[in-house]
Amino acid sequence: SGTTNTVAAYNLTWKSTNFKTILEWEPKPVNQVYTVQISTKSGDWKSKCFYTTDTECDLTDEIVKDVKQTYLARVFSYPAGNVESTGSAGEPLYENSPEFTPYLETNLGQPTIQSFEQVGTKVNVTVEDERTLVRRNNTFLSLRDVFGKDLIYTLYYWKSSSSGKKTAKTNTNEFLIDVDKGENYCFSVQAVIPSRTVNRKSTDSPVECMGQEKGEFREI
């Protein structure tokens, strides 16, 4: 129950990629506003997105303080223009989010192939180490900085003339693969956190092929 015309938020959903984290909910407000609070399991509640008519709240700044913590958020509903008004129990209506552990649950963003270089029958493929919004000592950490060896990359590579995708794996950001001389190859990479049970894989990077500007060929 609550004051007339005020409904509790529902379908609270975490949307998170590379630790950029937004809480979304329903419904679109009619004569009401929302405030969000976030807390770790053992911490105090912190209010964000005060009296907003949005149905989302960016909580990145809070969760990046410790991405291995488990967070809980709640969304309060207030009548528009009367935010002091409370429900019949003397408190505003609110709904809890599911728990969220960024390190285990943030989606892996689409990776990018930074470069590839062919030397004879070897090709070195380098994956861009994407910057996250996680900070340490006032600098933004890369995905590799945050996940360390928990993060691997799968390289798919294939001859331009064929469809079968060979694979290689690395726990760094570089691959060194054997290729057939005189053949053009295409590449795509996927970020993976094998230790996870959900959100283990990223979407595939854009395909890059030999003969395009990212690559370099050296005959030796």
């Epitope: 691997i152 094998p194 049970t197 283990r200 894989k201």
Partner: antibody
Framework: EVQLVESGGGLVQPGGSLRLSCAAS????????IHWVRQAPGKGLEWVGY????????YYADSVKGRFTISADTSKNTAYLQMNSLRAEDTAVYYC?????????????WGQGTLVTVSS | DIQMTQSPSSLSASVGDRVTITCRAS??????VAWYQQKPGKAPKLLIY???FLYSGVPSRFSGSRSGTDFTLTISSLQPEDFATYYC?????????FGQGTKVEIK
Amino acid sequence: EVQLVESGGGLVQPGGSLRLSCAASGFTISQYWIHWVRQAPGKGLEWVGYIDPYNGYTYYADSVKGRFTISADTSKNTAYLQMNSLRAEDTAVYYCARDYGSWRIRLDYWGQGTLVTVSS
Amino acid sequence: DIQMTQSPSSLSASVGDRVTITCRASQDVNTAVAWYQQKPGKAPKLLIYSASFLYSGVPSRFSGSRSGTDFTLTISSLQPEDFATYYCQQHYTTPPTFGQGTKVEIK
């Protein structure tokens, strides 16, 4: 509990077709890779091919290329091996296996296998 | 394709014996080698991954090692349940390839 169950094996004539299924439970196939491995009677293990159900990428052993097709239905959490133009030398127990996908660990769970016999 | 040459193809041993099986890769495969145990009528089971790491639930009498392109599976004290066929496999490149297998029989 992670489980893989193959089905669809049987007796087929040379030149015929058969479709094997690999039903997974205890994990979501789109988050892993699925391989097919076969073993002819009294022989060793031979890798057949793999699929990444997340993007549909596949690769096949030369011995089956152009005849076998691996696919996956993520809504059914099942992978398939479509075998066409079968030959006597394709007679084997066919296993599907989960690829954990790490740099270190690969085929960590296997199904019990299904026997395919190609004979006239 | 990378060839994995496994030896011996079979061996006879007694309970309590130390058993060594080797696999040689035809080119560098880093540590991307696994060892599997297979019993008649059953699927292979992962024993060792990344050349020397014991898979969860596998008894500590099993161990693996690497020296360049040579890989070794050792059973320190053979138990009755260890009589089986053992396979090495490289997963450094596609296609992954298996050794021919080593059958460990009772002497």
